[in-house]
């Protein structure tokens, strides 16, 4: 019957994700018992995405690889609301790689998922970015300006933030 086939589909979808996420936390979306959205445990969720703060210190390239192994990317921040959600889980004395880089050192910033870089929706600290050698972006806390972005050398190890779309089952 219908409920049985729906359950089978869910189970196969869960098996798909099990290789990198042994445990998922799911919530019912809306009033329909058939629609569940999930994030890997212990990722956090905001709108249609899941977020993971990686506390291991790695270069930007290794951080992105680490996210991709989990089916995610380094975080792409699209709105002020999204940034405000993310910073609730960050430590003020740490810096975290974003999915934003300037691969050619030409001040042509680009997001890892090819989201167009929009100068009007950026949260650089004042006077940033400011160095052709610093081709990767972090988010960090400055007492004068709170949380914002800074450009740094990509090979300098930092913590990072991964982001993936919610899993719908």
């Amino acid at each position: 019957n219908f409920m049985y086939s729906k359950t089978v589909k869910r189970l196969s979808k869960l098996r798909e994700y099990q290789q990198y996420h042994p445990s998922l936390t799911c919530v019912m979306e809306g009033k329909d018992i058939e629609d569940w959205s999930c994030c890997p445990t212990p990722w956090t969720s905001f709108q249609s995405s899941c977020y993971f703060i990686s506390t291991g210190m790695q270069s930007w390239t290794k951080s992105q690889k680490n996210c991709s192994v989990m089916g995610a990317d380094l975080v792409v921040i699209n709105t002020r609301e999204e940034q405000d959600f993310i910073i609730q889980n960050l430590k003020r004395n740490s810096s975290y790689f974003l999915g934003l880089s300037d691969p050619g050192g030409r001040r042509h910033w680009q997001w890892v998922d090819q989201t167009p870089y929009n100068e009007n929706v950026t949260f650089w600290h004042s006077g940033e970015p400011n160095n052709l050698d610093e081709r990767c972006a972090i988010i960090n806390f400055r007492s004068s300006e709170e949380w914002g972005w800074n450009d740094i050398h990509c090979h300098v190890p930092q913590k990072s933030i991964c982001k993936m779309k919610k899993i719908y089952i």
Epitope: G104, G105, R106, R107, G127, N130, N131, L132, D133, H153, H155
Partner: antibody, heavy 118, light 107 residues
Framework: QVQLQQSGAEVVKPGASVKISCKGS????????MHWVRQAHAKSLEWIGV????????NYNQKFKGKVTMTVDTSSSTAYMELSRLRSDDTAVYYC???????????WGQGTLVTVSS | DIQMTQTTSSLSASLGDRVTISCRAS??????LNWYQQKPDGTVKLLIY???RLHSGVPSRFSGSGSGTDYSLTISNLDQEDIATYFC?????????FGGGTKLEIK
Amino acid sequence: QVQLQQSGAEVVKPGASVKISCKGSGYTFTDYSMHWVRQAHAKSLEWIGVISTYYGDSNYNQKFKGKVTMTVDTSSSTAYMELSRLRSDDTAVYYCARNGNFYVMDYWGQGTLVTVSS
Amino acid sequence: DIQMTQTTSSLSASLGDRVTISCRASQDISNYLNWYQQKPDGTVKLLIYYTSRLHSGVPSRFSGSGSGTDYSLTISNLDQEDIATYFCQQGNTLPWTFGGGTKLEIK
């Protein structure tokens, strides 16, 4: 202290090539890109381009594309700029300068005079 | 390319004078304006970066100001060793470009 030591003056014939060097000391060479700037006699400064000492890639001023090739040798902390198909109007002092924060060139070499003459 | 214009190509002043050198960009350069000093022997030194920040080792008599397209360098108490040509440079957009220079002489 930061120092950029450039190679000596060169006199070359039209159509020939010349390679000038810039050795960095007093800092971690691969942490800072190297810019090249030229100044023709009694003229202003002209930005030629910049090479990343870490990645090895270059950004050239369109005006100098095809004229200039920038390279680095990290083992000797030296940046090089080769000028090809030289003409008399390439006669100038060529400077190397270290990249710094706020899109600036914070330390400069002493300059290398290249004279193109038959 | 962004054009940088230093309208005064040479300037004569007396020791102890306050001297101001101006520089205009053909478009807004978001304060990414730097000043360099070139001595008669060809030596080039950075003086001021990001409009108003003093580079290490530069005497405090040098100061910079401006915003948008208009910037200036001020030497508050002219010294004999300030005899040089001064260049502005924008770093806002590649290719980086320089002003034509202002040669400072002593009266």
